[in-house]
Interface confidence: medium
């Protein structure tokens, strides 16, 4: 599923990532924007042998098991399969373990390069929350 | 236990396109990726591609893109990979392969002929 | 893409021989390296996995060995049922790779 901006901003507040450790829903908005452009079923594949996934681009050298990557940890213990759903609550659930992992979003490159100390509320401006 | 059965021998045309299927039973078929290998003689293993089925997310080695096409049906657990414009560079041996980095599970293999 | 390169292409052997068969990477990756054996009209089956543990099912005659660029596969005391094609393959990265194999055959 390829959400749109208002109606992933909603989901996300729905699974109560708006401050969620301090970090207002626009920077998730932005963050899921430029990791995956709102696509839940973003795949990209690492240097490393591991892969990312879903809505956030999720690792899964360390967050999830998709079978196939060396000395994975699956800390978020879901296969990885499940943050490729339409519904993202494995993808926040995980999400929320990432961020409260020591180094809050910056686990994200695409937040740290694109959304952090931007004007991340234009990403929810305009929606009916 | 887990099992890949794949489809029969097949004899084509050239320039014809020709679909193979894989079906997975003993396991999750979403959670895993769905790996295709090719085999012709002299010519050793060749890794075509790969699919997720629980998303349909695929994977190209860049010297097959535009020769196969993945897709996945969750409801039967079977994969499918086909092969167009075929000619005879294409007859070969086709495995699926669970994707777990190593290949532990493979499909007997389908042959394909191609000739006219 | 990450070339493998085995030798030799064909060993000749007496069962009761102990042989090593070798695959060199063009590049490292690390441990990511797998063995196959290959019968005659069989399917690959997996030998070793991650250059040194052995696959479920494997006697332990079967060993391998390396990291980086150079890994060993071990035969000891060679069985009339171990002759046919070895492969090895890498997982290090995309696209997955494999050697062009070496022949086992008996003397």
């Known amino acids: 599923k390829v959400f749109g901006r208002c109606e992933l901003a909603a989901a996300m507040k729905r699974h109560g990532l708006d401050n969620y450790r301090g970090y207002s829903l626009g920077n998730w908005v932005c963050a899921a924007k430029f990791e995956s452009n709102f696509n839940t079923q973003a795949t990209n594949r690492n240097t490393d042998g591991s892969t990312d996934y879903g809505i956030l681009q999720i690792n899964s050298r360390w967050w999830c098991n998709d079978g196939r990557t060396p000395g994975s940890r699956n800390l978020c213990n879901i296969p990885c399969s499940a943050l490729l759903s339409s519904d993202i609550t494995a993808s926040v659930n995980c999400a929320k373990k990432i961020v409260s992992d020591g180094n809050g979003m910056n686990a994200w490159v695409a937040w740290r390069n694109r959304c952090k100390g931007t004007d991340v509320q234009a990403w929810i401006r305009g929606c009916r929350l | 236990q887990v099992q890949l059965q794949e489809s029969g021998a097949e004899v084509m045309k050239p320039g014809a396109s020709v679909k193979i299927s894989c079906k997975a039973t003993g396991y999750t078929f979403t959670t895993y990726w769905i790996e295709w290998v090719k085999q012709r003689p002299g010519h050793g293993l060749e890794w075509i591609g790969e699919i997720l089925p629980g998303s349909g997310s695929t994977y190209y080695n860049e010297k097959f893109k535009g020769k196969a096409t993945f897709t996945a049906d969750t409801s039967s657990n079977t994969a499918y990979m086909q092969l167009s414009s075929l000619t005879s560079e294409d007859s070969a041996v086709y495995y699926c392969a669970r994707g777990d980095g190593y290949y532990c599970y493979w499909g007997q293999g389908t042959t394909l002929t191609v000739s006219s | 893409d990450i070339e493998l390169t085995q030798s030799p292409a064909t060993l000749s052997v007496t069962p009761g021989d102990s042989v090593s068969l070798s695959c060199r990477a063009s590049q490292s990756i690390s441990n990511n390296l797998h063995w196959y054996q290959q019968k005659s009209h069989e399917s690959p089956r997996l030998l070793i996995k991650y250059a040194s543990q052995r696959a479920s099912g494997i006697p332990s005659r079967f060993s391998g060995s390396g990291s980086g660029t150079d890994f060993t596969l071990s035969i000891n005391s060679v069985e009339t049922e171990d002759f046919g094609m070895y492969f090895c393959?890498?997982?290090?990265?995309?696209?997955?790779?494999f050697g062009g194999g070496t022949k086992l055959e008996i003397k």
């Open positions: 393959q890498q997982s290090n990265s995309w696209p997955r790779t």
